[in-house]
Amino acid sequence: LSTGVSFFFLSFHISNLQFNSSLEDPSTDYYQELQRDISEMFLQIYKQGGFLGLSNIKFRPG
Amino acid sequence: SVVVQLTLAFREGTINVHDVETQFNQYKTEAASRYNLTISDVSVSDVPFPFSAQSGAG
C-alpha cells in the first residue's frame, strides 16, 4: 500500500563546526540552535510544493 | 566537523532522488553566507521499504 509520501535519507558534513557533547543533548542551546538553522535552511531549499518536512535529525562527530 | 543525518519527506511523485541532492548542493553557497554553515560530502538515498511503505502499487 502506498502512503503518498516519499522519504529520503540525507547526510552531510558541516566542516566549520566542531562536534562536542552538547550535540548529543537536545536540551542544549547549541543543539537547538543548529537544529533550528538546519530546519529553516531546508524550508528555504525545498520551498516549492511537495516538501512535507524533516525528522530524525542526528548529529555525529565528523 | 559535524555530521548531520536526517530524513526528508515529500509528497510522493513530486521529486526524484537526483533533484533532492541537486537542490541541496546548489544551496551550499547560500548556506555558508546565511547560516555560516560550510557544507560538504552530501549523500542522499531513498529510505527503503518498509519505512516509507513505498513498494506497493499506487
Epitope: G50 | G13, T14, N16, T22, Q26, D46, Q54, G58
Partner: antibody
Framework: QVQLVQSGAEVKKPGASVKVSCKAS????????MHWIKQAPGQGLEWIGY????????HYNQKFKDKVTLTADKSASTAYMELYSLRSEDTAVYYC?????????????WGQGTLVTVSS | DIQMTQSPSSLSASVGDRVTITCRAS??????LVWYQQKPGKSPKLLVY???TLTDGVPSRFSGSGSGTQYSLTISSLQPEDVATYYC?????????FGSGTKLEIK
C-alpha cells in the same frame, strides 16, 4: 506553441569538434531544463546530460563527461551541445528535449534531431 | 547506475490484439518511469509518465502500470498507426537511462 528547432546535419572528420544548437520558442526558456539524447544508427536512446538555462547548472552522464559540453544562451533562447574529439562511434542523431516544469519528470517536447556523421 | 531491461525486443501482433511491453529496473525507481513512442525517422513522443499517467492526446487504448522495479505498457487494441519502437526511461536518478526499445510490428 512550444517548438525546439535544431541545427542541420553535420559531417565531420575524426578528431574535429561540432556544436549543435537547439532554438526554443513558445515558452520561457529559463524555467525548463534542457536535456540531450544520443541515438546511434539503428540503436536505442542514450541520455547525455542536461542544462538548467536559468542557473547554467549542468549534469552529465559520466560516460559523456569528457566528450560533451552543454551551454545555453538565454538571450537567444538557445541551448548548445558541443562534441569534442569526434570518433566514428559518435556518429548519431542527437536530440534536445525539454523536461516538463516543476515535478514533471518526463520529456514533453523534443527537437527534430541533428545527424552528426564522423567520417574520414 | 539503474539498468532498464525491456522486453520483448521485438513483437509482431495483429490489429485488435492486446499487446504488453515490460520494463524492469535494476532498483526501485518509485514510479518515475516514462514511456515514449518513436516512429521511423521521427523524434520520440511522450506517451506515459509517472508509470501510469497518460499524456494529453494519447489514445486511451494505451495504459501504463507497475511499481517498484516492474513496469508495463499495454495497448488494449492494436491499431496500424501504433507501429513504432517503444522505450521506457528511468527518471528516478541519473543517469536517466532508457530501455533498449521494443519494435512493434503488425502481422
Amino acid at each position: 506553441q512550444v517548438q525546439l528547432v535544431q541545427s542541420g546535419a553535420e559531417v565531420k572528420k575524426p578528431g574535429a569538434s561540432v556544436k549543435v544548437s537547439c532554438k526554443a520558442s513558445g515558452y520561457t526558456f529559463t524555467t525548463y531544463t534542457m536535456h540531450w539524447i544520443k541515438q546511434a544508427p539503428g540503436q536505442g536512446l542514450e541520455w547525455i546530460g542536461y542544462i538548467n538555462p536559468g542557473s547554467d547548472y549542468t549534469h552529465y552522464n559520466q560516460k559523456f563527461k569528457d566528450k560533451v559540453t552543454l551551454t545555453a544562451d538565454k538571450s537567444a533562447s538557445t541551448a548548445y551541445m558541443e562534441l569534442y574529439s569526434l570518433r566514428s562511434e559518435d556518429t548519431a542523431v542527437y536530440y534536445c528535449a525539454r523536461q516538463g516544469n516543476y515535478a514533471a519528470y518526463y520529456f514533453d517536447y523534443w527537437g527534430q534531431g541533428t545527424l552528426v556523421t564522423v567520417s574520414s | 547506475d539503474i539498468q532498464m531491461t525491456q522486453s520483448p525486443s521485438s513483437l509482431s501482433a495483429s490489429v485488435g490484439d492486446r499487446v504488453t511491453i515490460t520494463c524492469r529496473a535494476s532498483g526501485n525507481i518509485h514510479n518515475f518511469l516514462v514511456w515514449y513512442q518513436q516512429k521511423p525517422g521521427k523524434s520520440p513522443k511522450l506517451l506515459v509518465y509517472n508509470a501510469k499517467t497518460l499524456t494529453d492526446g494519447v489514445p486511451s487504448r494505451f495504459s501504463g502500470s507497475g511499481s517498484g522495479t516492474q513496469y508495463s505498457l499495454t495497448i488494449s487494441s492494436l491499431q496500424p498507426e501504433d507501429v513504432a519502437t517503444y522505450y521506457c526511461q528511468n527518471f528516478w536518478n541519473v543517469p536517466f537511462t532508457f530501455g533498449s526499445g521494443t519494435k512493434l510490428e503488425i502481422k
